[in-house]
Interface confidence: low
């Protein structure tokens, strides 16, 4: 409602159109529709968006016009349900259209597919892209939004507008350059990699909200914002957490117009209150809106205030601990988390949340005891092993990464995770292990004080990918257990898994290990994926194979590919040498 609180907006769609402007309105509606109907052709979505936009304009002109008072879910849902091919394209998703709001929107959300059956995006020649960009810039950029949104149905919509702005800037600059490819391709690679990372980070936020509830998300936000803004008062952090929770709840719920609007509001508030939030925001706040919001989200941690008192005084030594806890449990725990996090930028958010959970469990037990103070006096001692576990794990894995390099480190993780959860599909194991392996180059270069927040919070994002992909087609009780029991203990849960002794090895299939000359034309990355796919399959056939056995087979395989790619008759080489390799591998592994 407005400041004057006369009444709610007569027309929500007109309100959002006026707030966001036509360009952002159309882009956000396109993203919303593409995230819901992931298989629909681009042209169909553009038509739907244009119809919604024209309708919104009539409501701006006259808010009392017919249907202008309907909710955005009703308007958008009605529009999606006009798609003629809904039943044949989406099957049971069409049943959503028989429901009323809000159940209909919930139904659409449940049918979002994290792994849609869509062709891989192939990048055309630079000249082809530049011609398309110059011929119709608007369509070119809409196509970008559409292709990303349908493949990443939880992509943070206002951030996708920022990516599109950078995408446009790259083409505007590089299509005029002397060497278009040298200018454009690195920029597109950077956008692709950043986009994948952004999508995965947002997917964790949505999973946190949807699977573990608002309280879990708010706890995460208190910890992260307290690390980032350690000079801010608890009340200020609480306000930011409330606003941030609203923004992400809206985006994860498909309310993209409200989400973008509220995110702009939040960025504005933060910039107007920099003095009471952080000294690091100045540069961010001088940027235009999309850049500003992105910059704030990535801003470095402010310096910790000097002379912060010991935590023990308020949270252990005070005789009022149980009284304060009983009066307002979540506020007291929030203050504990805030005070601990602002003192520990060197801890991961998930570690801070584990400590807060341990503290909460201790108070629940001790505040009901005969002598509460005596009972909780040693609570901080319980934190030591919780802190040491990720520290040791990161130390060991960084040493292994430095010894092996990224590709071989990924292979070590592939073997490790395939042995833990061999039922998981090979493409998922390859994707997840490759991403887990990237933690080395991403985080091991950092000094000790930055390693844990970098590594463990990144691993949370990657393991969430495993969880959402596995949820679509569950095959392993162990994965389900680690994914659903505790959000903050997912990584320790997976780390603790040993080889699955109940697994019945996969039948040997020579076809899986048959390769052709097309492997020679692949990029280095795609060739690695082929080899890593073969490695996972080997482990599934022979889960008890030793590291040495697997290394020998993989070395033979690499030599075989190199030899045949240099041969004159590549296809014959792959056929003949391939048979020899399979026989040798079977012998080496005792298959």
């Amino acid at each position: 409602r407005g400041v004057f609180r006369r009444d709610a907006h007569k027309s929500e769609v007109a309100h959002r159109f006026k707030d966001l402007g036509e360009e952002n309105f159309k882009a956000l509606v396109l993203i919303a529709f593409a995230q819901y109907l992931q298989q629909c052709p681009f042209e169909d979505h553009v038509k739907l968006v244009n119809e919604v936009t024209e309708f919104a304009k009539t409501c701006v002109a006259d808010e009392s016009a017919e249907n202008c008072d309907k909710s955005l879910h009703t308007l958008f849902g009605d529009k999606l349900c006009t798609v003629a091919t809904l039943r044949e394209t989406y099957g049971e998703m069409a049943d959503c259209c028989a429901k009323q709001e809000p159940e209909r929107n919930e139904c659409f959300l449940q049918h979002k597919d994290d792994n849609p059956n869509l062709p891989r995006l192939v990048r055309p020649e630079v000249d082809v892209m530049c011609t398309a960009f110059h011929d119709n810039e608007e369509t070119f950029l809409k196509k970008y939004l559409y292709e990303i949104a349908r493949r990443h149905p939880y992509f943070y919509a206002p951030e996708l507008l920022f990516f599109a702005k950078r995408y446009k800037a790259a083409f505007t600059e590089c299509c005029q350059a002397a060497d278009k490819a040298a200018c454009l391709l690195p920029k597109l690679d950077e956008l692709r990699d950043e986009g994948k990372a952004s999508s995965a980070k947002q997917r964790l936020k949505c999973a946190s909200l949807q699977k573990f509830g608002e309280r879990a998300f708010k706890a995460w936000a208190v910890a992260r914002l307290s690390q980032r803004f350690p000079k801010a008062e608890f009340a200020e952090v609480s306000k930011l957490v409330t606003d941030l929770t609203k923004v992400h709840t809206e985006c994860c719920h498909g309310d993209l117009l409200e989400c973008a609007d509220d995110r702009a509001d939040l960025a504005k508030y933060i910039c107007e209150n920099q003095d009471s939030i952080s000294s690091k925001l100045k540069e961010c706040c001088e940027k235009p809106l999309l850049e500003k919001s992105h910059c704030i989200a990535e801003v470095e941690n402010d310096e910790m205030p000097a002379d912060l008192p010991s935590l023990a005084a308020d949270f252990v030594e005070s005789k009022d601990v149980c009284k304060n806890y009983a009066e307002a449990k979540d506020v007291f725990l929030g203050m504990f988390l805030y005070e601990y996090a602002r003192r520990h930028p060197d801890y991961s958010v998930v570690l801070l949340l584990r400590l807060a959970k341990t503290y909460e469990t201790t108070l629940e037990k001790c505040c009901a005891a005969a002598d509460p103070h005596e009972c909780y006096a040693k609570v901080f001692d319980e934190f030591k092993p919780l802190v040491e576990e990720p520290q040791n794990l990161i130390k060991q894995n960084c040493e292994l990464f430095e010894q092996l390099g990224e590709y071989k480190f990924q292979n070590a993780l592939l073997v490790r995770y395939t042995k833990k959860v061999p039922q998981v599909s090979t493409p998922t194991l390859v994707e997840v292990s490759r991403n887990l392996g990237k933690v080395g180059s991403k985080c091991c270069k950092h000094p000790e004080a930055k390693r844990m927040p970098c590594a463990e919070d990144y691993l949370s994002v990657v393991l969430n990918q495993l969880c959402v992909l596995h949820e679509k087609t569950p095959v392993s009780d162990r994965v389900t257990k680690c994914c659903t029991e505790s959000l903050v203990n997912r990584r320790p849960c997976f780390s603790a898994l040993e080889v699955d002794e109940t697994y019945v090895p996969k039948e040997f299939n020579a076809e899986t290990f048959t390769f052709h000359a097309d492997i020679c034309t692949l990029s280095e990355k795609e060739r690695q994926i082929k080899k890593q796919t073969a490695l996972v399959e080997l482990v599934k056939h022979k889960p008890k194979a030793t590291k040495e056995q697997l290394k020998a087979v993989m070395d033979d395989f690499a030599a075989f590919v190199e030899k045949c790619c240099k041969a004159d008759d590549k296809e014959t080489c792959f056929a003949e040498e391939g048979k020899k390799l399979v026989a040798a591998s079977q012998a080496a592994l005792g298959l």
């Epitope: 407005g2 400041v3 609180r5 907006h9 609007d261 702009a264 509001d265």
Partner: nanobody, 115 residues
Framework: EVQLVESGGGLVQPGGSLRLSCAAS????????MAWYRQAPGKQREFVSR???????NYPDSVKGRFTISRDNSKNTLYLQMNSLRAEDTAVYYC?????????WGQGTLVTVSS
């Protein structure tokens, strides 16, 4: 569109008080936030105070404790009570409003603090 008209400016001595008013008309139901800004001669426009849709207010340190923003819903009017005025508060004061950011502006009212 939203129309905003400020009033209440004038000459006041250091340490004195003034109350500025801003009357809003037009599509005011779309307004989520209202604010006061000021611009001294030869200087950039500066944020003075804001009241959001929820009634929360904020001020920069330069006016905190001296200025108070408030509103009267029944009259669609925004106020700025200015106490302990200083010479450096001399400026044209603008009322601003909008759904997300302050996109509608008044013409301004001049406040001069001088002995």
């Amino acid at each position: 569109e939203v129309q905003l008209v400020e009033s209440g400016g004038g000459l006041v001595q250091p340490g004195g008080s003034l109350r500025l008013s801003c009357a809003a008309s037009g599509s005011i139901e779309s307004i989520n936030r209202m604010a006061w800004y000021r611009q001294a001669p030869g200087k950039q426009r500066e944020f003075v105070s804001r009241i959001s849709k929820g009634g929360s207010t904020n001020y920069p340190d330069s006016v905190k404790g001296r200025f108070t923003i408030s509103r009267d819903n029944s009259k669609n009017t925004l106020y700025l009570q200015m106490n302990s005025l200083r010479a450096e508060d001399t400026a044209v004061y603008y009322c601003a409003a909008g759904p997300v950011w302050e996109q509608f502006w008044g013409q301004g009212t001049l406040v001069t603090v001088s002995s």
